[in-house]
Interface confidence: medium
Amino acid sequence: LEVQVPEDPVVALVGTDATLCCSFSPEPGFSLAQLNLIWQLTDTKQLVHSFAEGQDQGSAYANRTALFPDLLAQGNASLRLQRVRVADEGSFTCFVSIRDFGSAAVSLQVAAPYSKPSMTLEPNKDLRPGDTVTITCSSYQGYPEAEVFWQDGQGVPLTGNVTTSQMANEQGLFDVHSILRVVLGANGTYSCLVRNPVLQQDAHSSVTITPQRSPTGAVEVQVPEDPVVALVGTDATLRCSFSPEPGFSLAQLNLIWQLTDTKQLVHSFTEGRDQGSAYANRTALFPDLLAQGNASLRLQRVRVADEGSFTCFVSIRDFGSAAVSLQVAAPYSKPSMTLEPNKDLRPGDTVTITCSSYRGYPEAEVFWQDGQGVPLTGNVTTSQMANEQGLFDVHSVLRVVLGANGTYSCLVRNPVLQQDAHGSVTITGQPMTFPPEA
């Protein structure tokens, strides 16, 4: 019995659902009573899901798997794995037994995009040419391990004094911390690029250091020039710093964070005390760092509604303020492709191909092309609907007249994460049915 699975690994984003495709060719007169289907982990032989004696025997894998019962009779033995975790990564074997027996293994590659790196300097004040500075580039919650590249403002790679560490959290996602030690020139730009090798996603940030003393007078409040990009559900740090003078004590400090547009209070520190969060109890300061001039705000469990500008007001004897932008993002899932009609297809038939990608933010850009890279723009209709959390589901519909065979691929781009997710469907045969039976 010939059992067919994709040659390439199935790539799934953490938290999304993945379909491990597996198909066989049922003979005429085939009934489900004859079918024994077993999905198991290839290496450990642990049972994942089974179908026997005409019945779905259910999930043996944390209740996160399902078959496609309506499609089994047509030879579709695919497995749906829900809420993918890093620990799911590996090889799954699909065993099919009717009268004969066949099996094939499909690889699941798990991935998670890295956040836009945050850059910190140590020391971060009173810098002079010739000083040695440690620049730390941190990027969070990605998988698999990242590649990190440093370069200067002219694109020259900086490889000499770089130390990169990657620590996995309980979910197996990596936080990357890359440290560059440099001797300052008159001024310099240093950029760090964090690449996810599976998603081919690049996240990068730069810091420009101009070593000079701050002018006296008003408090100089420093925030990042670029928006802080945060993934929905993760925590974000809105960086804000000031330079305390010798003898400064927290009793002198008034710190207020507020929404720039509405002036709504977010968090404050006055009279030597943290006054707490006025923003849904999801904000916190860094109390141990305030005395050193770190007025940054931690925003927890970021939501789409948090996007916008936050102002950091610092008053000691003098007063200063600066605004930092928060850009919220969520990666789009790997597109699922559906055909209508999906069986008995012949050259000349008009087919509607739907490409669906879920729970991304902000709105996506969608591009279609054929198997030779030719863009398909004629009969495309794309709709994007936001759910209650403000995340978008994208549905792009392409109407095509079939040739003898053809590949149609859809690319869904997240313009903020510069993350591309793409799906393809290949229509072959004459006549044929989708999904392919063999």
């Epitope: 890279g373 030719v374 863009p375 793409h422």
Partner: antibody
Framework: EVQLVQSGAEVKKPGSSVKVSCKAS????????IHWVRQAPGQGLEWMGY????????DYAQKFQGRVTLTADKSTSTAYMELSSLRSEDTAVYYC??????????????WGQGTTVTVSS | EIVLTQSPDFQSVTPKEKVTITCRAS?????MNWYQQKPDQSPKLLIK???NLASGVPSRFSGSGSGTDFTLTINSLEAEDAATYYC?????????FGQGTKLEIK
């Protein structure tokens, strides 16, 4: 070695037609589209159209619709570009190029050496 | 059609200088390719898919950008880089090139 070799220079009268050939070697001719790009003296690159040698599907830039015909001969791995109703503004170097890559990223990785077409009375 | 506008049209630069050429698309594109053309030669692929160096291209060339704004950067220009540079997209029909940026070495 992957290469595209084009036919030699042509001098044509206004109103006539020209047919330029582009012979592919070193790869599977039917696996990639062949595009035609022209460049008038001192000017930039201008896309004319492409042909899929396998399906023989073609698409042309609107400017050349009705005047250009792209064909391909699988047996000889050769693509052809025929431009009719020539005028002096069609004097240019004509390039064929292979559009390569894989979903979703594609690019012209191999170019012919160019064929100079001069239209003059 | 998507119009690609390069700037500058012409630049005269000295060796070792850093050069930045920008390409702005009239609508968002999925990626950008860059080509180099020297006098009396065919164009040559330089950067593919926005930021990936083509085979054999020196590392002083780099590409970046997304959406509608893309950049080709040459760090520490060399005499052999005198050429015309073109950006190209095919996210939607027709395929278009930028008008070209000519680099002259002083």
């Amino acid at each position: 070695e992957v290469q595209l070799v084009q036919s030699g220079a042509e001098v044509k009268k206004p109103g006539s037609s020209v047919k330029v050939s582009c012979k592919a070697s070193g790869y599977s001719f039917t696996s990639y589209t062949i595009h035609w790009v022209r460049q008038a003296p001192g000017q930039g690159l201008e896309w004319m159209g492409y042909i899929n040698p396998n399906s023989r599907n073609t698409d042309y830039a609107q400017k050349f619709q009705g005047r250009v015909t792209l064909t391909a001969d699988k047996s000889t791995s050769t693509a052809y570009m025929e431009l009719s109703s020539l005028r002096s503004e069609d004097t240019a170097v004509y390039y064929c190029a292979r559009y390569s890559g894989s979903t979703p990223y594609w690019y012209f990785d191999v170019w012919g050496q160019g064929t100079t077409v001069t239209v003059s009375s | 059609e998507i119009v690609l506008t390069q700037s500058p049209d012409f630049q005269s630069v000295t060796p070792k200088e850093k050069v930045t050429i920008t390409c702005r698309a009239s609508s968002s594109v999925s990626y950008m390719n860059w080509y180099q053309q020297k006098p009396d030669q065919s164009p040559k692929l330089l950067i593919k898919a926005t930021s990936n160096l083509a085979s054999g291209v020196p590392s002083r060339f780099s590409g970046s950008g997304s959406g509608t704004d893309f950049t080709l950067t040459i760090n520490s220009l060399e005499a052999e880089d005198a050429a015309t540079y073109y950006c190209q997209q095919w996210s939607s029909n027709p395929l278009t090139f930028g008008q070209g940026t000519k680099l002259e070495i002083k």
